[in-house]
């Protein structure tokens, strides 16, 4: 397919004319930031960016590469290295600790350097970093943490909690050894650590003592309760602030949003992670767009500003399942959340930054005609005489031997939400994958955001930029009508 | 492997503030471009960036990741948009087009816009665009391409020629119905549609008439001259130039080099590409890093200013072949090129660009340890109780089955250079990838590459920063001390 | 011109040990893989050993028939190659055979051989 | 490791025949064969490399084609002096010959 108008020199030297134009008048702005969002792409790496792109286009019946991202629009891109202490390719515990502490940690770990190692929970204590939402806290902004997985996932996690095993997500998680020693679990130290003032995403079953049935699936035993200790975490937290109010569906988000008398809010619309886009019943659970207005809504409040963490969490899961249908939809949904976010803050005031924590062996080859389906088959056969997909991975489930070869796929069934695409490897979940990933900025101080950085370097940008410490001697004018 | 320092957080934050106050002083020269150079590694990802960086550090007793490639040192970085007018995957001739010319083309076509067809002699006429290095001549610099490849190849040929099929190399190439309708082959176009001062890399054997012996393998037929039509190009370029030299070994290049007589160099150092790094007889062939930096000394002669392209154009091939080895091998010596014109050329007045045009299905997974060698194996076993590498590919011939299954693999297997990392599906070539790739961007008007951009981007970009068509209006501060 | 010339054979006890030698000229050494090759009496032509150049850390790769027994080394200064065969047995008769790759379409051929050095394993 | 399995293993063949020896590979070898001839007291001689490519000084009769794991050295015309023992042999990895076809004049 060749549009017409791309076959005129003109059409491309227009369209660059105006692209030089724009990067002209780019002006780094000298102010402070009062407001800090940081989205995180959990697995989103440039080749997942690249064809959501193009779904995302074709989706609006474009041909797809053409279009743009709510995220290709930010201004800045730099590079991030990925790399954790211990491994060339990270996990999502020890890159949060990078992007939102600073620091780099070791795999498995969050919230600590790398003086702790992996599920040794006397190497805790002293080796705590400090996330730059706690720093934002104590500067009298409001903060809030908004996820598509369990809000005690690694990603989110890495904001307030300190621990050295990342599935410590409840204390039933926690060895008896590691609960006398001292450590918490996630749960526990996502009400306990710092006050957050907007929690919404899943994870409802490792706020309740074992037995406490779950309000959406109150029959289904594995989905209640998980406690040991008989705490009520939700019932603690509501208790620590006059104003704060609990939400499990999306009816009671939306009602919480907009009523001024709630200062605090936690939403758990699932019991573990948030059900892929997909599959979501939207008219219990809110998408992630809708988390994030709900959370703005609220921090927005606060005339000294805020700091918000938007995760589109389930990029990973879609890719760990070899399922690029999952992972690529639910990038679109993150990004349709980077987008309203952009319509609900100015530029002039928020430094937003976009990234992922790590990447995934998910590749998108074999010279499909533009306007093909991104799910579909690259013209052709392979070696095997046999369809193969364009959208492919390194390993994964997705490896299948059928009679000792490779199975043949069609065009219907690889454009199925269930389809695995092949890998060169079988493994039970795809790995992540270990080069740099993306990191587009907007807003006071973006152009800070350059070249090829340690992903730590995220951290440092957004506590610089909005003069927290160790920057509170940032030397940047506030911002523009700042009511603080 | 734990270094003793990373478990400190004062290093990670220590190195954070010293990027953040660098990422500070940043500030975006004013001045116009005397000289422009384009890095292009092709087939380059960001996923080949990383693994030659963890490569090329470990190749200095370093761990890897955390060492710095010389590209990795430019203070600007963009996403390129690669697909072709076409295809969502591209070819290195349209990406040329893009890159080069600043018009988006069609598959395996070269220097044409989108109207012209593949193979279609009769849709070339009309529909050429031209490349920025013509522009660059047309303004009085002088102008260069050193490839790795045969000078012939569709990348540099996007710097000088127009041709519907990338394939033509001679005329022997080129069908007769085509060669009647008035197509020509891309070695003449080579050496008649422009001036070009400096033209080194491969393709000897595309210059000279059927039955002339290659002067390097004067007994193997297959090596020698391929041409038709009886023409000795090389001859027909040495009368165009009083100053002109032929080259065709590594002693003969590096004392024209040095030689004021010499205005014009071309040095084609094998018959078809130039060998693999890894593979070069010292002796007889230039490296890429001495070609680049021999173009260096005739081109900056010039008072005026210079365009160069250099091309690692064999990273490409190494990926074709599933031989992660050779691609980053080939990856690594482009570095040393783009490493050793820094320090040849001034970022006060020369831009330079580093890019690829496009990636490919190559993937770096399986949560290696830090500091293993990125050959090597990912730690535990696939589902069928085999072991695996962390450099997998999507497509490609590595892909084997032994008995039915996938064959195990040892850590000295998997470290040859002879090695093929596995595949998802069996192909004779492996395929290029579509996702974004990097623009690294350091000098003069530098600042302007940013965001997300079309591939297009970058040759308005360099016409822009030197003032060339169409941006000879360009409103920009001469460069201090223009001698011009 | 490219010559290989092989050394080292002879009569050996099953057992014992032997070391040929392959002195390499005109070319530049350093810069190409060497290997070793064998023909035994009545049999087909075997590959025993490689060693890669200098671009390649001179890795080194052996058959299954010879490994841990065979060893493939250089001497760079010399443009020599060597093969060290211990605890030879009387199937490791042959001519043993030095070659050079070149690489042509990017593969190693065996472009030149050396005349061959006879290996006779006999108690 | 990649066997090669070569056929026949002796062939005869009258001046002027047309001679075909072919090799099958274990697995793809990329067109990277090569054949040699080998002459008793001789060292091996590199005929064709990359499936098809004549050495300089090789016959215009000799001709090799193949592509995955099937490949086939042609000799158009048979000569009297091409009679040897011809060898494939696989370099995409490491390196392997095949058992040998040994070439007789009826």
């Known amino acids: 397919i060749i549009p017409v108008e791309e076959e005129n020199p003109d059409f491309w030297n227009r369209q660059a004319a105006e692209a030089l134009g724009a990067a002209k008048k780019l002006q780094p702005a000298q102010t402070a930031a009062k407001n800090l969002i940081i989205f995180l792409g959990d697995g989103m790496g440039v080749s997942t960016v690249t064809a959501a792109r193009i779904l995302k286009g074709q989706k609006k019946d474009k041909l797809g590469p053409e279009t743009f991202l709510a995220m290709d629009r930010f201004p800045y891109v730099a590079l991030s290295k990925t790399y954790s202490v211990d491994k060339h390719v990270p996990d999502s515990g020890a890159t949060a600790t990078a992007y939102l502490c600073g620091v780099k940690g070791n795999f498995q770990t969050i919230g600590l350097s790398a003086a702790a190692r992996f599920n040794q929970c006397n190497t805790t204590r002293g080796n705590e970093v400090i996330s730059v939402m706690n720093r934002a806290k104590k500067a009298g902004k409001s903060v809030g943490v908004v996820t598509t997985t369990r809000v005690q996932h690694a990603s989110p996690a890495g904001a307030y909690a300190h621990t050295v095993n990342r599935n410590w997500y409840s204390d039933a998680d926690v060895p008896a050894s590691a609960r006398q020693e001292g450590c918490q679990d996630i749960a526990t130290q996502l009400i306990s650590n710092m006050d957050i003032d907007v929690i919404l995403g899943g994870g409802r079953k490792y706020m309740f003592p074992m037995g406490t049935p779950d309000p959406e699936y109150p029959d289904d035993y594995s989905q209640g309760g998980t406690r040991l200790d008989g705490k009520n975490l939700v019932q603690e937290w509501l208790a620590k602030h006059q104003g704060a109010r609990y939400v499990w569906n999306r009816t009671e988000l939306l009602q919480a949003s907009l009523d001024p008398s709630v200062t605090h809010l936690m939403g758990l619309f699932e019991p573990g992670d948030m059900k892929y886009e997909i599959h979501r019943d939207s008219t219990l659970d809110p998408s992630l767009m809708e988390m994030t207005e709900a959370a703005l809504l609220l921090l927005s409040r606060n005339p000294r500003g805020f700091f918000l963490f938007v995760e589109g969490g389930r990029i990973d899961h879609g890719h760990h399942e070899s399922r690029a249908y999952r992972a690529l939809t639910e990038t679109i949904m993150f990004d349709d959340a980077i987008e309203r976010a952009g319509q609900l803050t100015s530029e002039e005031d928020t430094l937003s930054l976009v990234t992922a924590d790590h990447s995934h062996v998910f590749s998108f080859g074999g010279y499909p005609l533009r306007g093909s389906s991104i799910f579909g088959l690259a013209p052709g056969k392979a070696r095997d005489r046999k369809a193969y997909t364009v959208l492919l991975y390194g390993n994964g489930p997705g490896y299948v031997l059928k009679d000792g070869a490779r199975p043949d796929v069609t065009e219907s069934e690889s454009g199925s939400p269930e389809y695995r695409q092949q890998s060169a490897v079988p493994l039970d979940g795809e790995t992540h994958a270990g080069e740099d990933v993306a990191v587009f900025a907007r807003g006071p101080q973006a152009h800070l955001v350059h070249g090829v950085q340690e992903q730590t370097f995220i951290a440092h940008v957004m506590a610089f930029a909005a003069c927290l410490e160790p920057y509170t001697a940032c030397d940047l004018a506030p911002r523009a009508g700042t009511t603080d | 492997i734990i270094p003793v320092e990373e478990e400190n957080p004062d290093f990670w934050n220590r190195q954070a503030a010293e990027a953040l106050g660098a990422a500070k002083k940043l500030q975006p020269a004013q001045t116009a471009a005397k000289n422009l150079i384009i890095f292009l590694g092709d087939g380059m990802g960001v996923s080949t960036v990383t693994a030659a960086r963890i490569l090329k550090g470990q190749k200095k007793d370093k761990l890897g990741p955390e060492t710095f490639l010389a590209m990795d040192r430019f203070p600007y970085v963009a996403l390129s948009k690669t697909y072709s007018v076409d295809k969502h995957v591209p070819d290195s001739g349209a990406t040329a087009t893009a890159y080069l010319c600043g018009v988006k083309g069609n598959f395996q076509t070269i220097g044409l816009s989108a109207a012209a067809r593949f193979n279609q002699c009769n849709t070339t006429r009309g529909n050429e665009v031209i490349s920025v290095m013509n522009r660059a001549k047309k303004a009085g610099k002088s102008v260069g391409v050193v490839t790795t490849t045969r000078v012939q190849h569709a990348s540099p040929a996007g710097a000088y020629a127009h041709t519907v099929n990338r394939n033509w190399y001679s005329d022997a190439d080129v069908p007769a119905s085509a060669r009647q309708e008035g197509c020509q082959d891309i070695a003449t176009q080579l050496i008649s549609n422009m001036d070009i001062d400096v033209i080194l890399g491969g393709g000897r054997k595309y210059m000279f008439p059927m039955g002339t012996p290659d002067p390097e393998y004067p007994d193997d037929y297959s090596q020698g001259g391929t041409r038709l039509d009886g023409k000795n190009l090389v001859q027909e370029w040495l009368a165009k130039h009083q100053g002109a030299r032929y080259v065709w070994n590594r002693t003969e290049l590096l004392q024209a080099s040095l030689d004021p007589s010499v205005t014009h160099l071309m040095g084609l150092f094998e018959p078809g590409d130039m060998k693999y790094e890894i593979h070069r007889d010292s002796t007889l062939d230039p490296s890429l890093m001495e070609m680049t930096e021999a173009a260096l000394l005739l081109l900056s002669r010039n008072p005026r200013g210079f365009f160069l392209f250099v091309e690692g154009g064999r990273i490409d091939h190494g990926h074709h072949e599933s031989r992660a080895y050779r691609a980053l091998t080939e990856t690594i010596m482009f570095d040393d090129a783009i490493e050793r014109a820094g320090q040849l050329t001034s970022e006060e007045d020369t831009l330079s660009l580093v890019t690829a045009d496009h990636s490919h299905v190559f993937s770096f997974g399986g949560y290696p340890l830090r500091g293993s060698s990125i050959f090597g194996l990912a730690p535990g076993k696939a589902r069928d109780r085999k072991a695996y590498t962390v450099l997998l590919y999507g497509n490609g011939p590595g892909y084997v089955l032994k008995d039915g299954a996938r064959p195990d693999v040892t850590e000295s297997e998997s470290g040859s250079p002879e090695y093929r990392q596995q595949s998802a599906v069996p192909l004779d070539g492996e395929t290029h990838a579509g996702e974004d790739v990097a623009v690294f961007a350091r000098g003069p008007q530098a600042h302007l590459v940013h965001g997300v951009q079309e591939q297009t981007f970058i040759a308005h970009v360099m016409a822009f920063a030197a003032c060339l068509e169409p941006y000879t209006a360009c409103d920009l501060a001469p460069r201090a001390g223009t001698t011009d | 011109e490219v010559q290989l010339v092989e050394s080292g054979g002879g009569l050996v006890q099953p057992g014992r040990s032997l070391r040929l030698s392959c002195t390499a000229s005109?070319?530049?050494?350093?810069?190409?893989?060497m290997s070793w090759f064998r023909q035994a009496p009545g049999k087909g032509l075997e590959w025993l050993a490689l060693i890669r150049n200098k671009a390649t850390g001179y890795t080194t790769e052996y058959s299954a028939s010879v490994k841990g027994r065979f060893t493939i080394s250089r001497d760079n200064s010399k443009s020599i190659a060597y093969l060290q065969m211990n605890s030879l047995k009387t199937e490791d008769t042959a001519v043993y055979y030095c070659?050079?790759?070149?690489?042509?379409?990017?593969?190693?051929?065996?472009?030149?051989w050396g005349q061959g050095t006879l290996v006779t394993v006999s108690s | 490791d990649t066997q090669m399995t070569q056929s026949p293993s002796s062939l005869s063949a009258s001046v002027g025949d047309r001679v075909t020896i072919t090799c099958k590979a274990s697995q793809d070898i990329n067109k990277y064969i090569a054949w040699f001839q080998y002459k008793t007291g001789k060292a091996p001689k590199l005929f064709i490399h990359?499936?098809?490519t004549l050495q300089p000084g090789v016959p215009s009769r000799f001709s090799g084609s193949g592509s995955g794991r099937d490949y086939t050295l042609t000799i158009s015309s048979l000569q009297p002096e091409d009679i040897a023992t011809y060898y494939c042999?696989?370099?995409?990895?490491?390196?392997?010959f095949g058992q040998g076809t040994k070439l007789e004049i009826k």
């Open positions: 990359y499936t098809s």
């Open positions: 005109g070319f530049t050494f350093t810069d190409y893989y």
């Open positions: 070659t050079r790759a070149s690489f042509y379409y990017d593969g190693k051929v065996l472009a030149y």
């Open positions: 042999l696989q370099y995409d990895n490491l390196y392997t």
